[in-house]
Interface confidence: low
Amino acid sequence: NQDLPVIKCVLINHKNNDSSVGKSSSYPMVSESPEDLGCALRPQSAGTVYEAATVEVDVSASITLQVLVDTPGNISCLWVFKHSSLNCQPHFDVQNRGVVSMVILKMTETQAGEYLLFIQSEATNYTIVFTVSIRNTLLFTLRRPYFRKMENQDALVCISESVPEPIVEWVLCDSQGESCKEESPAVVKKEEKVLHELFGTDIRCCARNELGRECTRLFTIDLNQTPQTTLPQLFLKVGEPLWIRCKAVHVNHGFGLTWELENKALEEGSYFEMSTYSTNRTMIRILFAFVSSVARNDTGYYTCSSSKHPSQSALVTIVEKGFINATNSSEDYEIDQYEEFCFSVRFKAYPQIRCTWTFSRKAFPCEQKALDDGYSVSKFCNHKHQPGEYIFHAENGDAQFTKMFTLNIRRKPQVLAEASASQASCSSDGYPLPSWTWKKCSDKSPNCTEDIPEGVWNRKANRKVFGQWVSSSTLNMSEAMKGFLVKCCAYNSLGTSCETILLNSPGPFPFIQDS
C-alpha cells in the first residue's frame, strides 16, 4: 500500500544508572546499540496496526522503546498504557525521520504489559503495539506479609513469600493517629522477622525487595479507646490468615479478656493471651484471635469482652476475590480561578489499591488515607487550575476502577484570531462558554460598532483539548468586506474580549488586542 508509512521499531537497552519510573521521552539517555523489533502489520485488524516483537526485560533494567517514522509532514502521537495516557513528544532526527520514544527506567512488574502508540500524520493514522514482559516473571514476586505465631513462644513471625528474598521489618508506634506516619519520630523500625514486643499501639510488618514495598497492619481493638462510630471491618480473602488483637489496660491484674465469634467462644487453640505491667504499674493484657487459613464460615462479628471494660466488636468479612467499591459516575466541577479545590474519591477496597491521577496524559502520584468508617479517600489538589479531564485509576490485583472528573475554570474569554483568503476565525476557551459578536470597522463606524448580521457561523464546544471545551466563530468573507477591519468579540458572565482582524491580509494578522 503506497499510503502506508515506512516505520521502524527498535529497542535500546540502557546501563542502569537511574531510579525513576517509566516515562515518555523524546531524548533517551546514552545507551547501547538499538535492536530492531521488526514492526509488522497485524493482519485482519481494524485500522492500521503494527506489532513489534515482544520485549523481555530483566527486573530493574532500563530500556527505551523507539519508533522511527519516515513520513512527510508533522506527526502527533499518544502513548496509552493500562488505560492511562502518557505524554508523547515526537522530534525529528538528522535524516528528518519522526522519532517517538518511551523510556522505562528500573523495570518492575507494574510496568509490564501492552504499550500502545497512536500516531497521526498528515497522510494517515496508525497504531503500534509493543508488548513488554518481565524476564523470569514467575521468579520475581512481592507478596503482602502475613503473621504466624512462633512455635512455643509468645511472639509473632512476619512472613512474605517473595522473590528475591525480601527484607522484613516491623514498624512500631505507640502514639495515636497522625503521629504514626512512616517518617514520624514516634515510629520505631526493627529489621527482623520475629517480634516479641506485642503490646504497642500500632504494629505493622513490611516487606521490601526490588519490586517495591508491601505492608500489613496488625488489626487491633483497644478496649480503652472510645469505639468508632462505625463498626471496624476487616476483609480477608479465602485462605488468608486472620489475626485480631484485643488490648486492654486496667489498674490491676484483676480482669480477663475473651473472644467470641457470633456469641460463641472461640475454640481452644484459636487464641493466646499475653500480659505485662506498664511503667505506671497498670496491667496491660492482649488477647490474639487467629485462624491460619480462613474459610467463608469464619465471617462474622468478633467480639472482645473484658470483666472490667465495655466489650467491642469487629466485623470480619471473608471474600472469594478482592474488590474496589466506589461510585464510578463522572463528576464535573467548576471553580473560580484562585479557588482552593481538591478532587476526591472515597472508596472501600481489599487488598489495598495502587492508584494514579492522570491529567493531560501525565500521571501524578496518588496518596490514600484511611477513614474511620472503613472507607479510604484519595485527594488530588495539584491541578494548578488547569481545566480539563482528570482521571483517577486504581487497581489491586483483583479489581480495577476508573473515575473521570472534569474541571472547568470560570474566567473571561481570551480570543485567538486568524484569517484566510475566504474567512476569519476566532476561538476562545473562556468558561462559561462564550457567545460571539462580529462588528465592522469603517469610516461610518470607527469604533467598530456596526453589526455584521450575516455570514457568521458559531461552533460551541466542538473541540476537546484534554477535556477542555473550546468555542469558535467563523465569518465567511464577502467581496464587499475585503480590505476592511472586523472585530470579533467573545463574551460571558465574567467579561468580554475582542480581536481585530484585517480581512484579505496575506496571512493571519490579528493586530489589536482589545479587552
Epitope: 461510585t327 459516575s329 463522572s330 463528576e331 464535573d332 466541577y333 467548576e334 471553580i335 479545590f341 472547568n408 470560570r410 468558561y431 462559561p432 462558554l433 460571558n492 458572565s493
Partner: nanobody, 125 residues
Framework: EVQLLESGGGLVQPGGSLTLSCAAS????????MGWFRQAPGKEREFVAA????????YYADSVKGRFTISRDNSKNTLYLQMNSLRAEDTAVYYC??????????????????WGQGTLVTVSS
Amino acid sequence: EVQLLESGGGLVQPGGSLTLSCAASERTFSSYTMGWFRQAPGKEREFVAAMSWSGGSTYYADSVKGRFTISRDNSKNTLYLQMNSLRAEDTAVYYCAAGGSTRVVVTTTPVVKYWGQGTLVTVSS
C-alpha cells in the same frame, strides 16, 4: 440550611407539557449546582437533569434528552424543569436537589446535600 420547595406537579395527558419549579430558601442558591431527580413507584430514585451553578453546563439523563429543559433564575432563587412530550413512563415524584458542595455537579445521589419534599407528576390519559 437550604430548604427546597417544589411546585407545578399534577396530572397531564401523554404528549402534554408541564413546568416544575423549585424555590430555594437561601440567598446562596446561586452558588449551588442544582438538579432534578425522580422516583417512580417501586423504583430507585434516578437522575433527570442538572445545571451547574453558573448555568455554564447542563446535564440530562438519556431518557429525557430533547424533551426536558432545565433552567435557573438566580435572581429569584428558583430552578425550573420544562417537560414536553410527556410519556406514561415519566410518571413519578420529582425531587429538586442541591449539590453536596458548592461546586459538584449533581448527577448522582451520593453528592446531593439537600433534597426537596417532591412533587407528583402523573402522565395518564
